[in-house]
């Protein structure tokens, strides 16, 4: 008795965070024995779409020519082989930006921070929102925080960081959103450059220095309590 078919891999190109109106391609990769691929979208009638495999049959392409609110959401894919349907893929969360006006991102007390001290990034929206997100460019896990105030509508969110180290230096943006759909985000804020100067740090190089994989809960999360598979995003609920 053969075991269950291995689950396929699901991903999006050019990525899973897409601006309104832009195109995105969802790929589902199974095995060479696949006869058909099916894409399901959470809270939509299944299947959301079906595609025949592309040669050499181990993957299928699902195209979205122009991103809109309707396409934002959580997807899984399956493939059918002669012995039946596979296990579902890990979920892919497709996020659309541009649903709301852009928030403002600022640094308190200043975007120029001494290493070892603290800085608070403040994301402010014109209209009340219940979710605010902070991202750092070129971080391995770009989404550092997601903050939900238990349904309370607020105009701003504070993202404290301490102690600031060289890892924190870089360009940040924030987004705002409503709790009813975490897949719909505002336009990004204008970028904020955080500059870290080094007067408090030990000048001796660490013998174990390695490439940082994240800016730490410094991602810091900054310690994510949940993750968004394949989207490159990490969510942290406070």
């Amino acid at each position: 008795q053969a075991g269950p078919l291995p689950k396929p891999t699901l991903w999006a190109e050019p990525g899973s965070v897409i601006s309104w109106g832009n195109s995105v391609t969802i790929w589902c990769q199974g095995t060479l024995e696949a006869r058909e691929y099916r894409l399901d979208k959470e809270e939509s009638p299944a299947p959301w779409d079906r595609q025949n495999p592309l040669e050499p049959k181990n993957k299928a392409r699902f195209s979205i020519p122009s991103m809109t609110e309707d396409y934002a959401g959580r997807y899984r894919c399956y493939y059918r082989s002669p012995v039946g349907w596979s296990q579902p893929s890990d979920p892919l969360e497709l996020v659309m930006t541009g649903a709301y006006s852009k928030p403002t991102l600022s640094a308190l007390p200043s975007p120029l921070v001494t290493s070892g001290k603290s800085v608070t990034l403040l994301c402010q929206s014109r209209s009340p929102m219940d979710t605010f997100l902070l991202i750092k460019e070129r971080a391995a896990h770009p989404l550092l925080h997601l903050r939900s105030e238990h349904g309370a509508q607020q105009h701003q969110a504070e993202f404290p960081m301490s102690p600031v180290t060289s890892v924190h230096g870089g360009t940040y943006r924030c987004f705002s959103s409503h709790g009813f759909s975490h897949y719909l985000l505002s336009h990004p804020s204008d970028p904020l450059e955080l500059i870290v100067s080094g007067s408090l740090e030990d000048p001796r190089p660490s013998p174990t220095r390695s490439v940082s994989t994240a800016a730490g809960p410094e991602d810091q999360p900054l310690m994510p309590t949940g993750s968004v598979p394949h989207s490159g995003l990490r969510r942290h609920w406070e």
Epitope: S118, S166, V211, A214, E218, Q220
Partner: antibody, heavy 118, light 107 residues
Framework: EVKLVESGGGLVKPGGSLKLSCAAS????????MSWVRQTPAKRLEWVAT????????YYTDSVKGRFTISRDNARNTLDLQMSSLRSEDTAMYYC???????????WGQGTSVTVSS | DIQMTQTTSSLSASLGDRVTISCRAS??????LNWYQQKPDGTVKLLIY???RLHSGVPSRFSGSGSGTDYSLTISNLEQEDIATYFC?????????FGGGTKLEIK
């Protein structure tokens, strides 16, 4: 489940050396800054040293500068504190703790005891 | 260095009481104030970070407030398991510093 387990404590003579280690599991170690905090016999908590997530920045309390070295191995998920020129005032319970990135230490180990006495 | 002062070193209260523990910083710490609980066996747990944010898994009877230099931890309905020593800590700038602790006992 986040787990931090310290080891290496013991009795050492003044002027001696000791290396404390902390084995981390249950989280992506390389994403977090880490610290050593000690608790004196009088039960006061004192921050000792911090190392950034990539090991590139290290920070020490004044009383241990030049004597203690904090280091980490992200491949092995370990944090170390090399202590030398030990003094009686270094006698304490030493805790390894994870940073939450927002100025707090969100998980602590159970501690390892260091006694400096002749 | 920033000095952290917990003026009350020990406190007696009855089960069910509302208990408030205070902490003062020697200068403005911009809400970077955290509270920890240390049980008699030495176990240390984070309760509250950034003045008022509850750490995951911490019961909602714990709350924090304050700003500038003055901060407090409140336990709204004291339970037996809350018997411990509570420490405040500033995370605004290194060196991070702790208060002297407040030992909570049952009357």
């Amino acid at each position: 489940e986040v787990k931090l387990v310290e080891s290496g404590g013991g009795l050492v003579k003044p002027g001696g050396s000791l290396k404390l280690s902390c084995a981390a599991s249950g989280f992506t170690f390389s994403s977090y800054a880490m610290s050593w905090v000690r608790q004196t016999p009088a039960k006061r908590l004192e921050w000792v040293a911090t190392i950034s997530s990539d090991g590139g920045n290290t920070y020490y309390t004044d009383s241990v500068k030049g004597r203690f070295t904090i280091s980490r191995d992200n491949a092995r998920n370990t944090l170390d504190l090399q202590m030398s020129s030990l003094r009686s005032e270094d006698t304490a319970m030493y805790y390894c703790a994870r940073h939450d990135g927002r100025g707090a230490l969100d998980y602590w180990g159970q501690g390892t005891s260091v006694t400096v006495s002749s | 260095d920033i000095q952290m002062t917990q003026t009350t070193s020990s406190l007696s209260a009855s089960l069910g009481d509302r208990v408030t523990i205070s902490c003062r910083a020697s200068q403005d710490i911009s809400n970077y104030l955290n509270w920890y609980q240390q049980k008699p066996d030495g176990t240390v747990k984070l309760l509250i970070y950034y003045t008022s944010r509850l750490h995951s898994g911490v019961p909602s009877r714990f709350s924090g407030s304050g700003s500038g230099t003055d901060y407090s931890l409140t336990i709204s309905n004291l339970e037996q398991e809350d018997i411990a020593t509570y420490f405040c800590q500033q995370g605004n700038t290194l060196p991070w510093t702790f208060g002297g602790g407040t030992k909570l006992e049952i009357k």
